[in-house]
């Protein structure tokens, strides 16, 4: 029997952003998907988005972007503008309609626990720790460098031979090596779809810069994708809706899969670098 799954995630880097993922497991082609919150469709629920496989998407606030992920799954990004987060306790429902065979609906909410897994929201703590590690690492390097310079100056004052130059060890590069791989692995734990290259090269005082390390982006910039060529509502001549309908179901199974957007993630020593990533197999 056909089933609908619903997964609600809180974005790792933006606590006010939520994403609802829904999918349809079963035979047949989908003719419409309706996403609502606060309850099932037509039973106290408020519509957030409607997605048609060929004619595009429609959405209502606070929905930010509705898109097809595969021919049988969708995602809906939500922006929570309020100070307190009502989404955390809200039920989101997805209804997949296959006209005239039937419709199937399921609901879900943000899991209360933050256990790792498909249904758990990515916890933002490790990324904050990674950023903190970067700041602390750089601060440590600077403090150590200052202390070392003061130490050298004192030694030079007390020494009779001022020509002697200390051998310059690049302590910053060593410090960078200590925390850069941990940042990569921390992010890898909480973004299973990202391919992360943890290679790095020793940084010098000139190249190591806190802005060089990009924290995990919430969303890569992408256009609404899906079985429809464009997510905008097509302008059709009045009375012509049936011609669209006639082509609608004959082509329902012919939609090619779409590739996911890339993620910009970890840099090498030359600055931020694009790393391939997907939001899932299309």
């Amino acid at each position: 029997t056909p089933e609908v799954w619903v997964q609600v995630q809180m974005e790792a880097t933006e606590l006010s952003s939520f994403t609802v993922h829904c999918g349809f497991l079963g035979p047949g082609s989908i003719s419409l998907v309706t996403v609502s919150w606060g309850g099932p469709d037509g039973a106290g629920g408020t519509k957030l988005a409607v997605l048609h496989p060929e004619l595009g998407t429609r959405q209502w606030a606070p929905a930010r972007q509705a898109r097809w992920e595969t021919q049988s799954s969708i995602s809906l990004a939500l922006e929570d503008s309020g100070a307190s987060s009502p989404f955390a306790n809200t039920t989101f429902c997805c209804k997949f309609a296959s006209f005239p065979e039937g419709s199937w609906e399921s609901c879900g909410s943000l899991p209360p626990s933050s256990d790792p897994g498909l249904s758990a929201p990515p916890t933002p703590v490790p990324i904050l720790r990674a950023d903190l590690a970067g700041i602390l690492g750089l601060s440590g390097v600077l403090l150590f460098g200052c202390g070392y310079l003061l130490h050298l100056l004192r030694r030079q004052k007390h020494r009779p031979t001022p020509r002697l130059q200390p051998s310059h060890t690049n302590s910053q590069a060593l410090t960078a090596q200590a925390w850069a791989p941990s940042q990569a692995s921390q992010a890898a734990l909480h973004d299973p779809y990202a391919t992360i290259n943890t290679s790095f090269c020793p940084a010098t005082l000139d190249t190591a810069h806190p802005n060089g390390w990009a924290s995990l982006p919430t969303h890569a910039a992408h256009q609404p994708q899906g079985p429809a060529a464009s997510a905008s509502t097509p302008i059709l001549a009045r009375g012509s809706f049936v011609s669209v309908e006639n082509g609608l179901y004959t082509q329902a199974g012919e939609r090619p899969p779409h590739t996911g957007p890339g993620l910009t993630l970890f840099p090498d020593c030359r600055g931020p670098r694009a790393v391939e990533g997907r939001f899932g197999v299309r």
Epitope: S31, L32, T34, D41, G42, K47, V50, H52, L55, G56, R58, K95, A97, F99, P100, S103, T233, P234, I235, L236, A237, R238, G239, S240, F241, V244, E245
Partner: nanobody
């Protein structure tokens, strides 16, 4: 979800008339349109007529001038008056409520359908 129950189907001679009714369990303001689709065996399903939330009726070209769609908000009922019926109008007729995409009413809920048979 909205429960839709169609009635009024049956068999009729070509040139005859039928009036289909669709009773909704409740009127839903969540959707944009309410209308009728039909599907004949071996043929593609097609939208016959629908009414927008603003009350504007739209028809497929093949039924213009013969079919009239109307609704009674007080009774939560949708009607399809079919005159000058032709054998090619034979199909299962579904009452739908849905969302507008341009001039197309995408079905979100629908009834079980009522059979219309037009013999020559």
């Amino acid at each position: 979800q909205v429960q839709l129950v169609e009635s009024g189907g049956g068999s009729v001679q070509a040139g005859g008339s039928l009036r289909l009714s669709c009773a909704a369990s409740r009127y839903t303001s969540r959707t944009d349109c309410m209308g009728w689709f039909r599907q004949a065996p071996g043929k593609e399903r097609e939208g016959v007529a629908h009414i927008d939330s603003d009350g504007i009726p739209r028809y497929v070209e093949s039924v213009k001038g013969r079919f009239t769609i109307s609704q009674d908000h007080a009774k939560n009922t949708l009607y399809l008056q079919m005159n000058s019926l032709k054998p090619e109008d034979s199909a299962t007729y579904y009452c739908v409520v849905g969302f507008k995409f341009g001039d197309y009413c995408a079905p979100n809920d629908w009834g079980q359908g009522t059979q219309v048979t037009v013999s020559s």
